[in-house]
């Protein structure tokens, strides 16, 4: 149960994560204009991953699409590389994912599949989550660079008399969604690659013992018992000398630290 | 088509207060910025504020904070401008105006006439 | 504030006759973000409102004749009128539609000789 549980909780919150790289991918919010200790302008800007924005104080909004990719700052590029690896290699997990999933049955797929592909899954999905936050974490850094730059030569201007006032950017309400849709992504992933382990075939913990019957001679090998898929009880596979004989099902219906993840 | 009505002529007393109103027809009136600028007689220009009447949200400018006080009523698609504690000073042409592209004011009320004297 | 710098004060000007009026900031109202000068032109007649002429420096509002140009960048815009008609006798006004407070020059007046 408890398996099941850390597999569809792992799925949900993978799920709720690559939404969010998405959406953060798509927001125009990256960066926003710095509004602390500026002049009080009738407009506002903010810049996102493929469009930058102006909303002028009459409400009208304005956005203006980068349709050069040569012209675009190499940081800028690998920030979308980053994402949209990361919306990828997620997706693909959770198609793996749906079908690794404990609770749904397709065909006679055996649990050692399930968990190979629970496996992948979670694996993708890390390294979906990491992608996003490096990402984010790259474009942040940007911002910051940026931000003192432009904060030291903040004015120009002819001997003090016309100034010019860059505009400064901070961080934009993307960013916070990106870093907390990666780190969602990220523990999906690693509540899938623990239950992953919850799923793998068990080794037995007794030693091949021969049988000599009549005729010919038969070796039972251990490991050969195949994990329950969860539907209906498998009271033919017992667990030898775990310290009684226990069904897999009340196996799973014990707590685990599983339960609480 | 786009109309800012505005209120009558006022003859005001010093120290008195006059609210005068800036009625919108002919467009949505929560969509818009509703600016109000002074005229003095013969004399340039000068910005006081502004109201949202989306949400009641102002903006004025330091010189004309707690002389004035914008208000709005979504109801009536109606503006208001108060002034209190009027002087001389205080005597000129009040005018609305609605915002848009490029943050200009592109329809401006008729104006409003306010003259203070004892 | 804002500082809006209008010259010259005033403009003689015969019917035909071409004329450029000027309007300086202390700032650049220039924003980078849409590459857009925040600048407006009004012209306003005795006993009347201000009218919108241009926004955005260049962009004339609809039912602006053509022959009211607005031109410039960063601090320094100019108003042109290629030919003056008589109708075009009024002040003209520029304002900085970039930082709050909003702020407007002192005008222009376009005079008949």
């Known amino acids: 149960m408890a398996v099941t549980a850390c597999q569809g909780l792992g799925f949900v919150v993978s799920l709720i994560g690559i939404a969010g790289i998405i959406a953060a991918t798509c927001m125009d919010q990256w960066s926003t204009q710095d509004l602390y200790n500026n002049p009080v302008t009738a407009v506002f800007n903010y810049q996102g991953l493929w469009r930058s924005c102006v909303r002028e104080s009459s409400g009208f909004t304005e956005c203006r699409g980068y349709f050069t990719l040569l012209g675009l700052p190499a940081m800028l590029q690998a920030v979308r590389a980053l994402m949209i690896v990361g919306i990828v290699l997620g997706a693909i997990g959770l198609l793996v994912s749906i079908f690794a999933l404990k609770c749904i049955r397709i065909g006679s797929m055996e649990d050692s599949a399930k968990a190979n592909m629970t496996l992948t899954s979670g694996i993708m999905f890390i390294v979906s989550g990491l992608c996003a936050i490096a990402g984010v974490s790259v474009f942040a850094n940007m911002l910051v660079t940026n931000f003192w730059m432009s904060t030291a030569n903040m004015y120009t201007g002819m001997g003090g008399m016309v100034q010019t006032v860059q505009t400064r950017y901070t961080f934009g309400a993307a960013l916070f969604v990106g870093w907390v849709a990666g780190g969602l992504t990220l523990i999906g992933g690693v509540m899938m690659c623990i239950a992953c382990r919850g799923l793998a075939p068990e080794e037995t913990n007794y030693k091949a013992v021969s049988y000599h019957a009549s005729g010919h001679s038969v070796a039972y090998k251990p490991g050969g018992f195949k994990a329950s898929t969860g539907f209906g009880s498998n009271t033919k596979n017992k667990k030898i000398y775990d310290g009684g004989a226990r069904t897999e099902d009340e196996v799973q219906s014990y707590p685990s630290k599983h339960d609480y993840v | 088509e786009v109309q800012l009505q505005q209120s009558g002529p006022e003859l005001v007393k010093p120290g008195a207060s006059v609210k005068m109103s800036c009625k919108a027809s002919?467009?949505?009136?929560?969509?818009?910025?509703m600016h109000w600028v002074k005229q003095k007689p013969g004399q340039g220009l000068e910005w006081i504020g502004y109201?949202?009447?989306?949400?009641?949200?102002?903006k004025y400018s330091e010189k004309f904070k707690g002389k004035a006080t914008l208000t709005s009523d979504k109801s009536s698609s109606t503006a208001f401008m108060e002034l209190s504690s009027l002087t001389s000073d205080d005597s000129a042409v009040y005018y609305c105006?609605?915002?848009?592209?490029?943050?200009?004011?592109?329809?401006w009320g008729q104006g409003t006439s306010v003259t203070v004297s004892s | 504030d804002i500082v809006m710098t209008q010259s010259p004060s005033s403009l003689t000007v015969t019917a035909g006759e071409r004329v450029t009026m000027r309007c300086r900031s202390t700032?650049?109202?220039?924003?980078?973000?849409?590459?857009?000068?925040?600048l407006t032109w009004y012209q306003q007649k005795p006993g009347q409102p201000p009218k919108l002429l241009i926004y955005w420096a260049s962009t004339r509002e609809s039912g602006v004749p053509d022959r009211f140009t607005g031109g410039g960048s960063g601090t320094d815009f100019t108003l042109t009128i290629s030919s003056v008609q008589a109708e075009d006798l009024a002040v003209y006004y520029c304002q900085n539609a970039y930082y709050y407070p909003l702020t407007f020059g002192a005008g222009t007046k376009l005079e008949r000789k």
């Open positions: 700032q650049s109202l220039f924003n980078s973000g849409n590459q857009k000068n925040y």
């Open positions: 105006a609605r915002l848009d592209y490029g943050n200009a004011m592109d329809y």
């Open positions: 002919g467009y949505t009136f929560t969509g818009f910025l």
């Open positions: 109201i949202n009447p989306y949400n009641d949200g102002t």
